[in-house]
Amino acid sequence: HSDGIFTDSYSRYRKQMAVKKYLAAVLGKRYKQRVKNK
């Protein structure tokens, strides 16, 4: 996940937001799976 050559604040911000969104989706899936398995 190198995300290109840009290191300016906007590129860093968009990358950080993408990571947060991705983690939220992954954690959300795991939570739903746990609830489903109970």
Partner: antibody, heavy 114, light 111 residues
């Protein structure tokens, strides 16, 4: 040569769907965020949205869920799925690399008409 | 969505002229500097000139420069060359990417 090539454009009826492809060559697309931009004939540029290296997406507020951006890193390709197409969606559609759109494809023309 | 207003919409100039194009945003861009400038020639894809308000993209001649902050930005061509007759667009990046938008464009034509 480092380049992006769009394909999948053509004539579609109002209400129809179309999937555009953007194939990368000369670099690994998996390392970059990718965006889509369109340009209606004789008009200006319009930002559609982008997809991160993680596969998360952001869209312009006017998209309203009609368009979906996805990627297949194994095929070095990004896609734009367009549904419920209208005459006003007639445009040249460009894909571009990273959040600053630093490398562009040549575009593919989508015509929505009955 | 944000509104980006470019002025003028058309600009007539001669080779060697100093040219200035402005881009005004209805709201502040991210970190006050998330703005890019592009050049487009008829039938061609746009080309990135400037990003982060003032950083010159790779391979772009130094006669192009960008300035501004917050809601007001400027693209300057210090000495217009024959290859510079084209349409120029600004693109704003915002805290909420749903607001991202291009300006309406400025056509630089031969006087």
């Amino acid at each position: 040569e480092v380049q992006l090539v769009e394909s999948g454009g053509g004539l579609v009826q109002p209400g129809g769907s179309l999937r555009l492809s953007c194939a990368a060559s000369g670099f690994s697309l998996s390392s970059y965020a990718m965006g889509w931009v369109r340009q209606a004939p004789g008009k200006g540029l319009e930002w559609i949205g982008d997809i991160s290296t993680y596969g998360t997406t952001d869209y312009a507020s006017w998209v309203y869920g009609r368009f979906t951006i996805s990627r297949d890193n194994s095929k070095n390709t990004v896609y734009l799925q367009m549904n419920s197409l209208r005459a006003e969606d007639t445009a040249v559609y460009f894909c571009a690399r990273d959040y600053w759109l630093s490398l562009w494809g040549q575009g593919t023309l989508v015509t929505v008409s009955s | 969505a944000a509104q980006l207003t470019q002025s003028p919409s058309t600009l007539s100039a001669s080779v060697g002229d100093r040219v200035t194009i402005t881009c005004q945003s209805s709201q502040s861009v991210y970190d006050n500097n998330a703005l890019a400038w592009y050049q487009q020639k008829p039938g061609k894809a746009p080309k990135l000139l400037i990003y982060a308000a003032s950083t010159l993209a790779s391979g772009v001649p130094s006669r192009f420069s960008g300035s501004g902050s917050g809601t007001e930005f400027t693209l300057t061509i210090s000495s217009l060359q024959p290859d510079d007759f084209a349409t120029y667009y600004c693109l704003g990046g915002y805290y909420d990417p749903a607001d991202n938008a291009f300006g309406g464009g400025t056509k630089v034509e031969i006087k």
